[in-house]
Amino acid sequence: EDELQVIQPEKSVSVAAGESATLRCAMTSLIPVGPIMWFRGAGAGRELIYNQKEGHFPRVTTVSELTKRNNLDFSISISNITPADAGTYYCVKFRKGSPDDVEFKSGAGTELSVRAKPS
């Protein structure tokens, strides 16, 4: 029970085009030290959606204040959803390394499906 777990409680989220999608993720521990990243898809071809450490992600906002001490909630909200955003999103914990951080543990994934905008 003590080892870090990555919790993605929703297995599937359905959002209408144009709306925002909230993808929930939390860690059960602050250890090991290292950033969280969100990806769409798995494997070598996965797409980086958000990097806690660096980068500019204009459509992504964090649900809670990530700089807050002892924060364990790494949920994100993606604005203005389009059908192209459909896919499975993974919240991934990295362990701080040198020179590169190392992937430590991934959440089970949340499948985002996009409904047509209500007329």
């Epitope: 029970e1 919790i7 297995k11 599937s12």
Partner: antibody, heavy 121, light 112 residues
Framework: QVQLVQSGAEVKKPGSSVKVSCKAS????????ISWVRQAPGQGLEWMGG????????NYAQKFQGRVTITADESTSTAYMELSSLRSEDTAVYYC??????????????WGQGTLVTVSS | DIVMTQSPLSLPVTPGEPASISCRSS???????????LDWYLQKPGQSPQLLIY???NRASGVPDRFSGSGSGTDFTLKISRVEAEDVGVYYC?????????FGGGTKVEIK
């Protein structure tokens, strides 16, 4: 051994509110989902909403949105369900149930004993 | 919301005989990770519900092996290979793929 112990039966007047508690022992409270499920007399099971304390915020079924508030106090490992604007149709047994974390996070593997709420004038 | 439909509503059974309950969902419960997010519960008379089967086909701890779950996507089945007197009660399927979680209407199993 995980146990969920709920508060006792309540009799309430229409229009009032009720707050039911569910104290958990065993396991790590913060990373488990606590759901609230109700059962009207002779009827089936109905999921009202749930909370994973580590996230702080709850999810609610549309039917109860605006009338139910689910909270969790990590310091006492207790979850609460408050239902307002009570009407006679809210007479039911209210259960709390705990789910596992990770890939089965909303699985209801442990249940409280149930709390009977009777709404009557 | 995902709608869960169970059949039959009532199932009279003879001890020692098999029994089968069907559950259908209004949309697929098969996730890209290969799991079906469908659970089965039994509520014995006067008791809280108890978990029988999770993720479509996995028996919960302490559940006798006469209970089995099968199916994928939108069609699921709970089978009891040989019904015992203690198996009477109401059986519910429930989907946990999407919030809100939704239950089937229940199937009442009673001894003939």
């Amino acid at each position: 051994q995980v146990q969920l112990v709920q508060s006792g039966a309540e009799v309430k007047k229409p229009g009032s509110s009720v707050k039911v508690s569910c104290k958990a022992s065993g396991g790590t409270f913060s990373s488990y989902a606590i759901s609230w499920v109700r059962q009207a007399p002779g009827q089936g099971l109905e999921w009202m909403g749930g909370i994973i304390p580590i996230f702080g915020t709850a999810n609610y079924a549309q039917k109860f949105q605006g009338r139910v508030t689910i909270t969790a106090d990590e310091s006492t490992s207790t979850a609460y369900m408050e239902l307002s604007s009570l009407r006679s149709e809210d007479t039911a047994v209210y259960y709390c149930a705990r789910g596992r974390p990770q890939s089965e996070s909303y699985l209801l593997d442990y249940w409280g004993q149930g709390t009977l709420v009777t709404v009557s004038s | 919301d995902i709608v869960m439909t169970q059949s039959p509503l009532s199932l009279p059974v003879t001890p020692g005989e098999p029994a089968s309950i069907s559950c259908r969902s209004s949309q697929s419960l098969l996730h890209s990770n290969g799991y079906n997010y469908l659970d089965w519960y039994l509520q014995k008379p006067g008791q809280s519900p108890q978990l029988l089967i999770y993720l479509g086909s996995n028996r919960a701890s302490g559940v006798p092996d006469r209970f089995s779950g099968s199916g994928s996507g939108t069609d699921f089945t709970l089978k009891i290979s040989r019904v015992e007197a203690e198996d009477v009660g109401v059986y519910y399927c429930m989907q946990t793929l999407q919030v809100p979680l939704t239950f089937g209407g229940g199937t009442k199993v009673e001894i003939k």
